[in-house]
């Protein structure tokens, strides 16, 4: 029972995590315009992995895709790659883990095969989660570096009265979605690996049986040892776990209904 629950919960947690990774990858708010300590602008900028957007105070939003591959920063390309690898591994992991679920019967699939599939999907989820966490962390590091660089020379062209204010970017909602989703996928993967250890058939030890023949004795040992990963009870109880993920785009909101500018 505990093994089925662990496996089912691992699957659900990973499913939510991968849905979160997909959502984060598609979200436009990886970096958002820093509003703190900046002149109050009537335009709000935010950027994703695939396009950058501008929302005017009128409500008009315009997004432009990055229609170039070579012109993009290597770091952004790396983040894209990590997130896509994470999604692909996670999707394959989900597919494998569906067939590995103890509560789902497929033909005469042996428990040892299910155990192997559970372990495989678990490892895939772990790597998927790590890819997402790495991707988001690389992007966050890039933001922090750029933030302090733009703070250092926030006002350029100070030779005269004219000032050009540089737009500084800070962490967007997608980063937090990505971190949480990556963590959930990682946890789900670990749970699948733990479940795997209890899924394989328990060791069956056959005692040696002696057959006495005339003249001399021969010891015959049939069967030997069946391969097993060890502990955990095998249960036939079936429990289906269901889960879903829901993400919402960050909406720029005013601190209060009345603003003085």
């Amino acid at each position: 029972m505990a093994v089925t629950a662990c496996q089912g919960l691992g699957f659900v947690v990973s499913l939510i995590g991968i849905a979160g990774i997909i959502a984060a990858t598609c979200m436009d708010q990886w970096s958002t315009q820093d509003l703190y300590n900046n002149p109050v602008t009537a335009v709000f900028n935010y950027q994703g992995l695939w396009r950058s957007c501008v929302r005017e105070s009128s409500g008009f939003t315009e997004c432009r895709g990055y229609f170039t591959l070579l012109g993009l920063p290597a770091m952004l390309q790396a983040v894209r790659a990590l997130m896509i690898v994470g999604i692909v591994l996670g999707a394959i992991g989900l597919l494998v883990s569906i067939f590995a679920l103890k509560c789902i019967r497929i033909g005469s699939m042996e428990d040892s095969a299910k155990a192997n599939m559970t372990l495989t999907s678990g490892i895939m989820f772990i790597v998927s989660g790590l890819c997402a966490i790495a991707g988001v962390s690389v992007f966050a590091n890039m933001l922090v570096t750029n933030f302090w660089m733009s703070t250092a020379n926030m006002y350029t062209g100070m030779g005269g009265m004219v000032q050009t204010v540089q737009t500084r970017y800070t962490f967007g909602a997608a980063l937090f979605v990505g971190w949480v989703a990556g963590g959930l996928t990682l946890i789900g993967g670990v749970m699948m690996c733990i479940a795997c250890r209890g899924l394989a058939p328990e060791e069956t030890n056959y005692k040696a049986v002696s057959y006495h023949a005339s003249g001399h004795s021969v010891a015959y040992k049939p069967g030997g040892f069946k391969a097993s990963t060890g502990f955990g009870s095998n249960t036939k109880n079936k429990k289906i776990y269901d889960g879903g993920a829901r993400t919402e785009d960050e909406v720029q909101s005013y601190p209060s209904k009345h603003d003085y500018v």
């Epitope: 900028n45 950058s52 501008v54 105070s57 009128s58 315009e62 432009r64 050009t164 209904k257």
Partner: antibody
Framework: QVQLQQSGAELMKPGASVKLSCKAS????????IEWIKQRPGHGLEWIGE????????KYNEKFKDKATFTADTSSNTAYMQLSSLTTEDSAIYYC????????????WGQGTTLTVSS | DIVMTQSPSSLTVTAGEKVTMSCKSS????????????LTWYQQKPGQPPKRLIY???TRESGVPDRFTGSGSGTDFTLTISSVQAEDLAVYYC?????????FGSGTKLEIK
């Protein structure tokens, strides 16, 4: 077609309060910001602030925060600006305008309300 | 607040002439996110409310004659009327619509000889 109809001219005494109205028609009133602008001869145009009738969100120019108060009645598609503690400096033409969807600028204007403050 | 400086304060021209007027802002009105300049030009004829001519520094309002052209970027902007007509007699204002509070220039009064 989009129209902003403002209330008629007002003659007020110093220290009094006045409420100017701006009735919108021809578009979804709740979806656009209504701007208030002051125009005095020799002083050009001054932005007082804005209100989004749908949410009640308001932004005031710091200069006018103690002078103007914005409200909106979505049932009658009317925006209001109340000016308090009137002085002769408040004598001006007051315009309401709609902030257009593009460019943050004002695409339709009311005809203006002339306010005269005199003892 | 952003200071918008318009020049000249007035100019007198004959019909058919080309006219340029300038508007300078104390800070850049260029938004790096979409590379648009948040500057608007308005025309105010005597006894009328202002009318939007150009927004995003160079985008002409629908219905505005193509003799009106907006140009410039960052802090320096220009409104050009390629061939002035008698009906262009008005005061022209530029407006910062990037930073709150929105601010207007003092205006350029165009007079026809």
């Amino acid at each position: 077609q989009v129209q902003l109809q403002q209330s008629g001219a007002e003659l007020m005494k110093p220290g009094a309060s006045v409420k100017l109205s701006c009735k919108a028609s021809g578009y979804t009133f709740t979806g656009y910001w209504i701007e208030w602008i002051k125009q005095r001869p020799g002083h050009g145009l001054e932005w007082i602030g804005e209100i989004l009738p749908g949410s009640g969100s308001i932004k005031y120019n710091e200069k006018f925060k103690d002078k103007a108060t914005f409200t909106a009645d979505t049932s009658s598609n009317t925006a209001y600006m109340q000016l308090s503690s009137l002085t002769t400096e408040d004598s001006a033409i007051y315009y309401c305008a709609r902030k257009g969807l593009r460019g943050n600028s004002f695409d339709y204007w009311g005809q203006g309300t002339t306010l005269t403050v005199s003892s | 607040d952003i200071v918008m400086t318009q020049s000249p304060s007035s100019l007198t021209v004959t019909a058919g002439e080309k006219v340029t007027m300038s508007c300078k802002s104390s800070q850049s009105l260029l938004n790096s996110g979409n590379q648009k300049n948040y500057l608007t030009w308005y025309q105010q004829k005597p006894g009328q409310p202002p009318k939007r001519l150009i927004y995003w520094a160079s985008t002409r309002e629908s219905g505005v004659p193509d003799r009106f052209t907006g140009s410039g970027s960052g802090t320096d902007f220009t409104l050009t009327i390629s061939s002035v007509q008698a009906e262009d007699l008005a005061v022209y204002y530029c407006q910062n619509d990037y930073y709150y509070p929105f601010t207007f220039g003092s205006g350029t009064k165009l007079e026809i000889k």
